[in-house]
């Protein structure tokens, strides 16, 4: 029997029944083994079928086999109920070999032609199954010339039988005090082959408790004991199991805070697998009673390890562990069953005792001394020399622990001083010089750094003067020693005051006449304000009313008398503001310059002299009654006059506060 | 020379008064103050107060206003210091000293030799 | 009322060697006044304003200082300088003294 190619020559080629197209002799028998590489098949198919018919193909016939496999026996032309004849059918060898064999009887009723087939190898496609047939792979499956191969997907690892997929399920470690597990794919089917580990793993303290949850299928044996698929469960003091079947195992208490369990699957088998939902208990913590005024959160029915709570105070009261004030509170339970912190207390917000205020006093609303949540104080100013600024003084004690006012606000009050008090009042009159007394000018100044000069006390730590008179020490201020309280020059008994700052004003040109003649001292320290010491106000915009032509002014300082000495004790005098054009027209013939008499300047004194300020009282106030207020304030700074002091015809010249109130305050608003 | 005299030791019995007198010389009695002070045995110096010689103006710690008087006599250039209701505790010398006059006022520039008041029963 | 803290309060020293003698303030002073008291005798001015040097008071004497620390320092002790020294302030009502420092023969 002549054999057919034999890869790896091409496989292909036409196979006919002998003296084809002519008809076959008798008594013919003929054989064709094809072969194709392997991961081939071949396939056939008929061009020409003419053979006799018999029943069942007694006769003639071509059969096809592959292997041991007989695919098809056939005769005749047509197929009938009995007989098979190709027609257009196509044949495929079961594996890389076929075997055609061609018979013919010892007669022909009448001449057949044969047969004439073509035939080629072509891949088989291993992927495609027939139906009910087992899937050639796990997962995928990948065919390709000459063959195939099988891949899993993620999570799995195809096993070395090179079709199965095994899943990678191991060393999964749960470690939060409860949670759920199951096989792989579960509620599907559980997959071959594989061997599952998973961990829990609580801390020290915890016990795990195992719930079999919704079904369990497992692969069983009626006899043996879990002999293909098993579930172990494994702790420290003993094993679980193994588990496998349709019944869900009891629950499992295993008194272990770490627990392993196996699951191990074979090569067959379509069951679903079990799931677990695990919980942790421990020994219990004493219940938390909140402490009066606060309470616990989260609210539980027991409170075991590693479980917290807080304690939250009501408002107006504050956490406090011992006598310790705490920000926040969370207790937490240990694996003893005791707590890690002990209660703490809910404690009444408490305030403390309320700041003093500066040139003021407070005073106990509530109860004397109480200073907790809600209670209320009331500051007030030192009556008469102080009044509070923009507050109504009434403070609350707030449970954030700080006493606050009814705007809000947390800070003290300020008490600023009453400015423009003084013991004496004017009658209008004119008249000599004379002694000042307690209290009547208690913003005057004594200014001692080289020369003797004077100012006015501005609030509680500034000092209204002359510019001219600090010039010298605009660049060391300290070097000025400032006086003030006292009636007397010499007096040991002054209120001691030092300079932090000198401001001449930009507009002063030293040793070039008197225009803008005027400094503020800043003091490094408030003075505190009494009978003695009170500043001066500062005119109002109304001020001009009360500082016409022939309206009277005082001047005081210590500055030179009629003797020609400095004065031992504070002189003042009555003078009345003379006509400025006027008091221009004194001051323009020699020896003075013209126009040595500003705008920024006022002048005041007698046409007859004999009344006038004078070296040593430069920088001190011309000072004013506002009748409406009832107050003094300044409307000049004694700046400059005639040689010889209360000369006839000559005037003090004084700089013209109202002219600079924007300077002023500017400066005193920025320092 | 400037100088400061003080009137000679004391001795008396609790309850009683003590004046002690401080005479000035070489300067002008009335341009000072003139201040006491004291200094009980072993120990430090005790401000008591001060008088300006040109008004009789005084002053005095508050420890001892109800107590000490302060007095002058502009004709004499003198100054005294009366002490009542002693004590024992009040044994001590007593000074009268100058106030300086040329930059501060806060210091004694002039010293009298000190008055040994002593209180005894 | 300032407190004034002295030390030493006593120190032994020999002829020719550098004496300092502090004087601390309870708070801020301004000006510094130190006195030199020989036994039976009143006190004698020595520094004021803190370094200015009495009249007739020899150089190796000499007074510094700001706010609550001031020192007197006798550059070179003199036979004559073996007294107690006192510090007085009055930047603050009432005027007070410290509590003395004596200094002795070695």
């Known amino acids: 029997t002549p054999l057919g190619p034999k890869w790896p020559e091409p496989v292909f080629g036409r196979l006919a029944s002998p003296g084809f197209p002519g008809e076959y002799a008798n008594d013919q028998e003929r054989r064709w083994t094809l072969t194709a590489p392997p991961g081939y098949r071949l396939r056939l198919y008929f061009t020409h079928f003419d053979l006799e018919l018999s029943h069942l193909c007694e006769y003639d016939f071509v059969k096809l086999s592959s292997g041991a496999k007989v695919l098809a026996t056939l005769c005749g032309q047509e197929s009938t109920d009995t007989e098979r004849a190709p027609g257009k059918d196509t044949f495929y060898s079961l594996g890389s070999s076929l075997d055609i064999t061609f018979r013919s009887d010892y007669s022909n009723e009448k001449p057949f032609t044969g047969f004439e087939a073509f035939y080629a190898a072509e891949d088989i496609d291993e992927c495609q199954v027939a139906p009910g047939e087992a899937p050639t792979c796990d997962h995928h499956c990948h065919n390709h010339l000459g063959g195939f191969y099988c891949s899993c997907r993620a999570g799995y690892v195809l096993h070395r039988n090179k079709r199965t997929c095994s899943a990678l399920c191991s060393g999964q470690v749960f470690t939060q005090r409860s949670g759920e597990l199951s096989s792989p794919e579960y509620p599907r089917p559980y997959p071959k082959l594989s061997s599952c580990t998973y961990s829990i793993s609580l801390e020290e303290g915890f016990s795990v408790i195992l719930d079999f949850v919704e079904s369990f299928d497992v692969e069983t044996h009626p006899e043996t004991l879990c002999p293909y698929d098993f579930l172990k469960i494994q702790t420290d003091r003993e094993e679980h199991g193994p588990f496998c079947g349709k019944t869900l195992p009891h629950r499992i208490e295993t008194k272990s805070n770490t627990v392993t369990i196996t699951f191990v699957t074979d090569e067959s088998g379509d069951h679903t697998g079990w799931k677990i939902h695990y919980t942790s208990t421990a020994q219990p913590c004493p219940y938390p009673m909140a402490p009066p005024n606060g309470h616990v959160s989260p609210v539980q029915a027991k409170y075991i390890l590693k479980d917290s709570f807080s304690i939250f105070c009501e408002t107006g009261y504050e956490l406090l562990q011992g006598h310790l004030p705490l920000k926040s509170f969370t207790a937490v339970c240990q694996k003893d069953g005791s707590w890690d912190r002990p209660m703490p207390a809910c404690s009444i917000v408490d305030c403390g005792p309320p700041d003093d205020l500066p040139s003021g006093r407070v005073e106990y609303i509530t109860g004397p001394g109480v200073t907790t949540y809600k209670a209320v104080i009331q500051y007030s100013c030192e009556e008469t020399f102080y009044t509070m600024k923009v507050n109504d003084g009434k403070y609350v004690c707030e449970a954030d622990g700080f006493w606050t006012s009814s705007k809000g606000e947390k800070s003290l009050p300020v008490c600023e001083p009453v400015c423009g008090l003084s013991a004496r009042t004017t009658g209008g009159r004119i008249y000599g010089g004379q002694k000042a007394k307690p209290g009547d000018f208690p913003w005057q100044v004594l200014i001692l750094g080289g020369t003797t000069a004077a100012g006015a006390l501005l609030y509680d730590n500034w000092v209204l003067t002359a510019a001219h008179a600090v010039y010298e020490q605009k660049h060391d201020a300290s070097a000025l020693d400032i006086r003030m309280g006292t009636l007397k020059r010499l007096s040991p008994h002054y209120t001691q005051a030092w300079s932090e700052a000198v401001f001449i004003h930009e507009g002063y040109t030293h040793d070039a006449g008197f225009d803008n003649d005027i400094a503020l001292i800043k003091l490094n320290n408030k003075v505190v304000i009494n009978s003695n010491i009170t500043p001066i106000c500062l005119p109002r915009k109304e001020a001009e009313s009360f500082m016409r032509t022939d309206d009277i002014g005082t001047a005081s300082g210590w500055g030179l008398t009629q003797r020609g000495f400095l004065a031992r004790n504070l002189m003042y005098v009555d003078i009345p503001i003379v006509d400025h054009q006027k008091c221009t027209a004194a001051y323009e013939k020699p020896p003075y310059p013209r126009g040595s008499v500003t705008a920024n300047m006022l002048c005041a004194g007698l046409e007859s002299g004999g009344k006038d300020s004078c070296r040593g009282d430069s920088g001190g106030a011309l000072v004013f009654l506002d009748s409406e207020t009832e107050r003094w304030f300044v409307g000049g700074i004694v700046s400059w006059g005639s040689m010889n002091c209360g000369e006839a015809g000559q005037y003090g010249v004084y700089t013209k506060v109202i002219n600079y109130i924007p300077w002023i305050e500017n400066i005193i608003s920025d320092f | 020379q400037v100088q400061l005299v003080q009137s000679g030791a004391e001795v008396k019995k609790p309850g009683a008064s003590v004046k002690v007198s401080c005479k000035a010389s070489g300067y002008t009695f009335t341009n000072y103050h003139m201040h006491w002070l004291r200094q009980a045995p072993g120990q430090g110096l005790e401000w008591i107060g001060d008088i300006d010689a040109s008004d009789s103006e005084t002053h005095y710690i508050e420890k001892f206003k109800d107590r000490a008087t302060l007095t002058i006599d502009k004709s004499s250039s003198t100054a005294y210091m009366e002490l009542s209701s002693l004590r024992s505790e009040d044994t001590a010398v007593y000074y009268c000293?100058?106030?300086?006059?040329?930059?501060?006022?806060?210091?004694?520039?002039?010293w009298g030799q000190g008055t040994l008041v002593t209180v005894s029963s | 009322d300032i407190q004034l803290t002295q030390s030493p309060s006593s120190l032994s020293a020999s002829v020719g060697d550098r004496v300092t003698i502090t004087c601390s303030a309870s708070s801020s002073v301004r000006y510094m006044y130190w006195y030199q008291q020989k036994p039976g005798k009143a006190p004698k001015l020595l520094i004021y304003d803190t370094s200015n040097l009495a009249s007739g008071v020899p150089s190796r004497f000499s007074g510094s200082g700001s706010g609550t620390d001031n020192t007197l320092t006798i550059s070179s002790l003199q036979p004559e300088d073996f007294a107690t020294y006192y510090c007085q302030q009055w930047s603050s009502y009432p005027l007070t003294f410290g509590q003395g420092t004596k200094v002795e023969i070695k």
């Open positions: 000293a100058r106030g300086d006059i040329t930059t501060t006022l806060r210091y004694f520039d002039v």
